[in-house]
């Protein structure tokens, strides 16, 4: 009831706490001399459900039967209305609608660790919408009982605060939870268990790993456990992997040898414990131990390629390139690469350690037969050397692959295709596809890329270090014993019209014709592989269409003659460049007047 109802009363029958669906009778009655002044028979009593008028009656009391109340609390307020005055509150009452508690389900108890305390959880069932008290009871041997009450509104967990000990691990304990509210009570089914059933060990701690003689093949994992632990399970994985390796061990006594770890790999290790083969539950996983395994000597062999460049009649430049070993092959941090260069007939050999690079350039005589061997070294040893004989890779014309083509294949990929060489195709031992950014100066510092292809393949998709709008010089080599043949082509993964035309830097007169010289378009403005240059000219101040001359693009060419100009006529000349996507804008304009005699 609303406290201190001086003017009257509101009573609720049968109770102010009712079961959902029940009917209640509400009575509002005025106390003596609390009605309307002089007009007691004109008293108008009004019953409100919260702010909604549900009934009224003239007189000293009002009765109302109410049904269909929702779950929860509903407030009823009784007011008095007198003529010529505001309604005044007389009294009020709340009605609490709920349900009796359902039987608690799935009662289960656990003790975390041998020194922990017993705690139980259960499922309450549907909300009662009333204050519901839960009592948890535990009975054990020798008529021992413990009881704990929960005053929390949504109670589904209680800790007894008692510790079960392993003195008699097979002794039975029985737990039961009872829910009580104003409308009834209900008890769970009893849950019976032993010490071994409910003790969940603490996760192992103090995890360490040792590698005997710094070897990955002699690795032991150590940890500490509670005293009664019988079983462990270990899980471990490389730190960059999502999949765990799992090992179950019995009576490990805090140590286990691991035999299948990879060298030079960071691993994550976790351990879990259990007290009994088929009773009880596994502990939580321990905190992770992260540790890196020791190095082992590299396996595998380096993929080595080379380039020869003529310097003069007696010398040649050899540039060697190699690819990093994969992580699984390197098996450690590669400290250096060892390159050995040997003249096969004279036996002269020179060895050099290369750090921080995957290439090496040297100058050697053009005479003699030369071979190189390259290996990778870490702290534990070296990989097997890759040996190659230096030869003229393009010398055997009959080994040259035929009909080489290069086509864009999606974003930043180029599909290179070819036909086998005319010479017996079965002689080909492998193809090598090589590509590098095209630089008009033939810059040897431009990174070289290559891939190897089996002798029965006639295509290769190149995607490594391929950028859009860049032209690549692509070579396909066919290798057979100590011979090689090659074919080349230009290709790009994406192209558009060049951003600018060539810049004419000079026009000179030679015997009645002119020689036009130009600067190459900067690589970043070429926007792919150039196919042609165009030279345009027309008479100055003329509105006629310009004449043009189209020149196939060649990397090193930067001049071209024109012999169709009339003497003593001033011409305006300019140039454009074309890719497969279109023509550039004009380059600079130059005026020129041929001085020679007319024909």
């Amino acid at each position: 009831k609303i406290d201190a109802c001086k003017r009257g009363d509101v009573t609720v029958k049968p109770s102010h706490v009712i079961l959902l669906g029940s009917t209640v009778n509400i009575t509002c009655s005025l106390k003596p001399r609390q009605g309307c002044f002089h007009y007691s028979r004109r008293n108008k009593l009004i019953l409100y459900k919260f702010d909604r008028r549900i009934n009224f009656h003239h007189g000293h009391s009002l009765n109302s039967q109410v049904t269909g109340l929702p779950l929860g609390t509903t407030l009823f307020v009784c007011k008095l209305a007198c003529i010529n005055s505001d309604e005044i509150q007389i009294c009020g009452a709340e009605i609490f609608v709920g349900v009796a508690p359902e039987q608690p389900q799935n009662l289960s108890c656990i003790q975390k660790g041998e020194q922990g305390t017993v705690a139980c959880t259960w499922e309450r069932g549907r909300d009662t919408h009333l204050y519901t008290e839960y009592t948890l009871q535990l009975s054990g041997p020798k008529n021992l009982t413990w009881q704990k009450q929960c005053k929390d509104i949504y109670c589904d967990y209680l800790d007894f605060g008692i510790n079960l000990t392993p003195e008699s691990p097979e002794s039975n304990f029985t737990a039961k939870v009872t829910a009580v509210n104003s409308l009834g009570s209900s008890s769970s089914l009893p849950s019976t268990f032993t010490f071994l059933d409910i003790v969940r060990p603490l996760p192992p701690w103090d995890i360490r790993i040792k590698f005997q003689k710094a070897s990955v093949s002699r690795c032991t994992l150590y940890w500490r456990d509670e005293g009664l632990v019988l079983l462990n399970r270990l899980r471990y994985r490389p730190s960059n992997s999502r999949l765990w390796n799992m090992v179950n061990v019995t009576k490990a006594k805090g140590r286990h040898d691991l035999l299948d770890l990879k060298p030079f790999t960071e691993y994550e290790f976790q351990i879990s414990s259990k007290l009994h083969l088929y009773k009880g539950s596994w502990s939580d996983w321990s905190e992770s131990l992260r540790a890196q395994t020791p190095e082992e000597e590299p396996t595998g062999m380096l993929d080595v390629w080379y380039m020869k460049r003529h310097i003069d009649y007696s010398r040649q430049q050899i540039s060697l390139f190699w690819k990093n070993l994969s992580v699984s092959e390197a098996r450690g941090k590669i400290l250096h690469y060892q390159v050995t260069l040997q003249e096969l007939t004279g036996g002269k050999a020179m060895t050099q350690n290369i750090t921080g690079h995957t290439s090496w350039t040297t100058v050697i005589p053009r005479t003699g037969n030369w071979a190189v061997a390259v290996s990778a070294a870490n702290s534990k040893g070296s990989s097997l050397p890759t040996r190659i004989n230096i030869m003229n890779l393009c010398e055997a014309g009959l080994l040259a692959p035929r009909q080489v083509s290069a086509n864009s294949e999606g974003m930043d990929n180029i599909l290179v295709t070819w036909q086998p060489p005319r010479k017996d195709p079965s002689a080909v031992q492998e193809y090598v596809v090589e590509w590098r950014e095209l630089h008009p100066g033939g810059d040897t510092q431009v990174p070289l890329n290559w891939l190897r292809s089996r002798p029965y393949n006639v295509s290769a998709l190149i995607s490594e270090n391929i950028k859009s709008y860049i032209c690549y010089e692509i070579r396909v080599y066919a290798l057979s014993g100590d011979q090689g043949g090659c074919s080349s082509i230009l290709g790009n993964s994406k192209h558009k019209a060049p951003l600018s035309g060539p810049h004419i830097n000079a026009i000179t007169e030679e015997k009645g014709s002119i020689l036009i010289s130009w600067n190459s378009i900067p690589v970043q403005e070429q926007m792919g592989c150039l196919l042609h240059y165009r030279i345009y000219w027309k008479e100055r101040d003329s509105n006629s269409q310009p004449q043009l001359c189209e020149i196939p693009y060649r990397v090193s060419q930067n001049s071209h003659p024109i012999n169709s100009l009339q003497p003593r006529v001033t011409y305006v000349l300019w140039m454009t460049a074309l890719t497969a996507a279109g023509e550039s804008s004009h380059g600079n304009e130059r005026e020129f007047c041929l001085q020679g005699k007319a024909n």
Partner: nanobody, 115 residues
């Protein structure tokens, strides 16, 4: 045991606003209504507004359109935003949590509206 503490009362001119709040201790309040009542000098305590556990709100005629009740179950707090205050709103404002085992009341906060 539930304890309630109101705050936010004070002296305000007619037409002004105040925001009352009432903070509870004890998690059981989340399943119950939370109410505001007021008591003017010489009068009995009367109901002003209620908010149910699921957030439905109700107002006495004198408060409708001017007052807004709200609750934050995480903070176990109920609020009463009072706008367009009139001198007749002067009273001590109490918050209340009704339960089937009895009502819990706060100590009240004084609101005075001067003309």
């Amino acid at each position: 045991q539930v304890q309630l503490q109101e705050s936010g009362g004070g002296l305000v001119q007619a037409g002004g606003s105040l925001n009352l709040s009432c903070t509870a201790s004890g998690s059981i309040i989340s399943i119950y209504n939370m109410d505001w009542y007021r008591q003017a000098p010489g009068n009995q305590r009367e109901w002003v507004a209620s908010i149910t556990s699921n957030g439905d709100s109700y107002y006495d005629g004198s408060a409708k359109g001017r007052f807004t009740i709200s609750r934050d179950n995480a903070k176990m707090t109920v609020y009463l935003q009072m706008n367009s205050l009139k001198p007749e709103d002067t009273a001590v404002y109490y918050c209340k949590v009704p339960t089937e085992n009895g009502n819990y009341w706060g100590q009240g906060t004084q609101v005075t509206v001067s003309s």
